[in-house]
């Protein structure tokens, strides 16, 4: 099975205990580690931060102790904007420009493959960004030579079912894919304005259309219907949680929300905890499970956070493992307990390393 | 600036062995395959063996298949091509090349060369 | 493994352009990048174009890469010839296991 981990960049800014560079990572617990994000300037595969260059470095030499690990450099993300990565796939000259930077980029930082992070093409960009894919590993099949192995090509896919319809075409972009992320969590938000987790394994009793799709099990049988082959797809599990604010003394699923969770230490987002802030934040806590959907939920105060434990992930590890997927992914391990300070468990990565165990075990 | 300096090459007896070395420095060595390419006097190029960026894979030309093995050590930043039962039809000139990340030799050794005569 | 045939040699005057060609005796030409190589006499190779049709920085724009499918061939052309450009051109190809050079064309400048 595959373990796609991801990490990133922005995380070296965290505070103290919070940052976290590519040499704190365990270069045996991953099969793939996926540097996010690079940028595109000037129709050209670019660094984002100051010292990516640095860090690049960094992250691949982990391979020289393990030759088996591979590494992606992620392309794109929520900050670089789907507008700009629309008009590069839109016009033929930028997509070429584009396609040919990529190849010596990687080669020369010593990655092993790009993926595509394109959050999200809009309707009119479903047929550009197939169009992307397919021009893209034409190209990683003429450059790879003798002592060059194929560049690998993957992308990280929404898991929700409005955004699959409008911005891919399933079985025509898996073609052309290594694999796919499907990116299964953040399916509830504080737009709903109730309290729910955000990385369900199965549908909620309660749930109505739309949230009937707001689930993994959904998302990943919805993906397969679609073309897209089990063996290619790699499910995505969070190493973080979302949080809410309750607006009444009401504290279980569904629950109203003033709004997003108060911001977290180290992480400083509203609304995200880290894995190794829920487990600061689990301390004087009340634990919860949500039986039908898999995982588990605390509050403490005023504070609600669905997230996912070593339990959550073993479950769905033995999901992925039941429906034949070719394995899991991980966003992020510098979210997850990468010192192995915070749980108490004196072990580093400790959801990561629950999902290696769980791929592992026959 | 990538410099490849290759070492190693002389005169010697048909079925002799030699080791020919290229030591490689500007640039991160471990990220690029290398490559060992030849040419007989007054004749063409010939591409003789290539070795992966972790040394993982190699692959030889049919004519040198099963004498000659190409090696790396990527913490001397140095690439190795072993030539056993050495011909008279291995005399050539040998380049040490750098598997570019654009052209796909895009540094090349200043060449070493070996004859092969009894 | 395949082949690349190339012209043993051509020649013209400073000034005029010269073609060369490299055709490959089996597979498709378009299935694998083309370069090609500058050697001038007692020198090291150095690359005039890669992948095709693309110029190392420092490559005069007189040089110039084409392929062409239906003579399953592909091209280097010498504009404005130059006295500096006398040489011998080799183009190379591979496959997932080889790398192959062309035979080699002595470009000779006249006068």
């Known amino acids: 099975y595959k373990l796609v981990c991801y990490y990133t960049s922005w995380s070296q800014y965290r505070e103290g205990d919070g940052s976290c560079f590519p040499d704190a990572l365990d270069r045996f617990l991953c099969t793939h580690i996926i540097y996010s994000f690079a940028n595109i300037s000037n129709d050209h595969i670019d660094t984002w931060e100051w010292n990516d260059v640095t860090l690049y470095g960094m992250l691949n030499t982990l391979k020289n102790r393990n030759p088996n690990l591979k590494t992606l450099l992620s392309v794109g993300g929520w900050n670089f904007g789907s507008q700009r990565f629309s008009k590069i796939a839109s016009n033929t000259q930028s997509r070429r420009t584009f396609i040919k930077s990529v190849p010596p980029f990687l080669r020369t930082h010593g990655f092993d493959g790009l993926d595509l992070a394109w959050l999200y093409p809009g309707r009119r960009d479903k047929q550009h960004f197939t169009t992307l894919i397919k021009e893209m590993k034409a190209e990683f099949i003429k450059e790879a030579q003798p002592g060059k192995k194929q560049l690998l090509l993957s992308a990280a896919l929404s898991a929700g079912k409005v955004t699959i319809d409008s911005s891919y075409d399933i079985a025509k972009i898996s073609q052309h894919l290594d694999f796919i992320s499907i990116m299964t969590y953040d399916f509830h938000g504080a737009w709903r304005g109730t309290t729910g987790h955000h990385s369900p394994l199965f549908r909620g009793q309660e749930d109505a259309s739309p949230d009937r799709f707001s689930n993994t099990d959904y998302a990943v049988g919805y993906m397969l219907r679609l073309g897209a082959p089990a063996s290619k797809l790699v499910m995505g599990i969070p190493t973080f949680g979302r949080s809410f604010t309750l607006a009444s003394s009401e504290t279980g699923v569904g629950a109203p929300i003033s709004g997003p969770g108060i911001p977290g230490r180290f992480t400083k987002e509203a609304g995200t905890l880290a894995y190794y802030e829920i487990c600061d934040f689990l301390r004087g806590a009340t634990v919860h499970r949500i039986l039908g959907q898999q995982v588990p939920y605390a509050t403490k105060g005023n504070q609600w956070v669905g997230y996912d434990d070593q339990e959550s992930v073993k479950s769905k590890v033995q999901y992925l493992k039941d429906r034949q997927l070719a394995g899991a992914m991980v966003w992020a391990l510098d979210l997850d307990d990468f010192q192995g300070s915070f749980c108490g468990q004196d072990l580093r990565f400790p959801l990561t390393n629950a999902i290696k165990d769980a791929l592992a075990a026959t | 600036e990538v410099q490849l300096l290759e070492s190693g090459g002389g005169l010697l007896q048909p079925g002799g062995s030699l080791r020919l070395s290229c030591a490689a420095s500007?640039?991160?060595?471990?990220?690029?395959?290398m490559t060992w390419v030849r040419q007989a006097p007054g004749k063409g190029l010939e591409w003789v063996s290539t070795?992966?960026?972790?040394?993982?894979?190699?692959f030889y030309a049919d004519s040198v298949k099963g004498h000659f093995t190409i090696s790396r050590d990527n913490s001397k930043d140095t690439v190795y091509l072993q030539m056993n039962s050495l011909r008279a039809e291995d005399t050539a000139v040998y380049y040490c090349?750098?598997?570019?990340?654009?052209?796909?030799?895009?540094?090349w050794g200043q060449g070493s060369p070996v004859t092969v005569s009894s | 493994n395949f082949m690349l045939t190339q012209p043993h040699s051509v020649s013209e005057s400073p000034g005029k352009t010269v073609t060369i060609s490299c055709t490959r005796s089996s597979g498709s030409i378009a299935s694998n990048y083309v370069q090609w190589y500058q050697q001038r006499p007692g020198s090291s190779p150095t690359t005039v174009i890669y992948e095709d049709n693309q110029r190392p920085s420092g490559v005069p724009d007189r040089f110039s890469g084409s392929i062409d499918s239906s003579s399953n061939s592909a091209s280097l052309t010498i504009s404005g010839l130059k006295t500096e450009d006398e040489a011998d051109y080799y183009c190379q190809s591979y496959d997932s296991s080889n790398y192959v050079f062309g035979t080699g064309t002595k470009v000779t400048v006249l006068g």
């Open positions: 090349a750098k598997g570019g990340h654009y052209s796909f030799f895009d540094s």
């Open positions: 500007g640039l991160t060595f471990r990220n690029y395959a």
């Open positions: 070795i992966s960026g972790n040394g993982d894979e190699t």
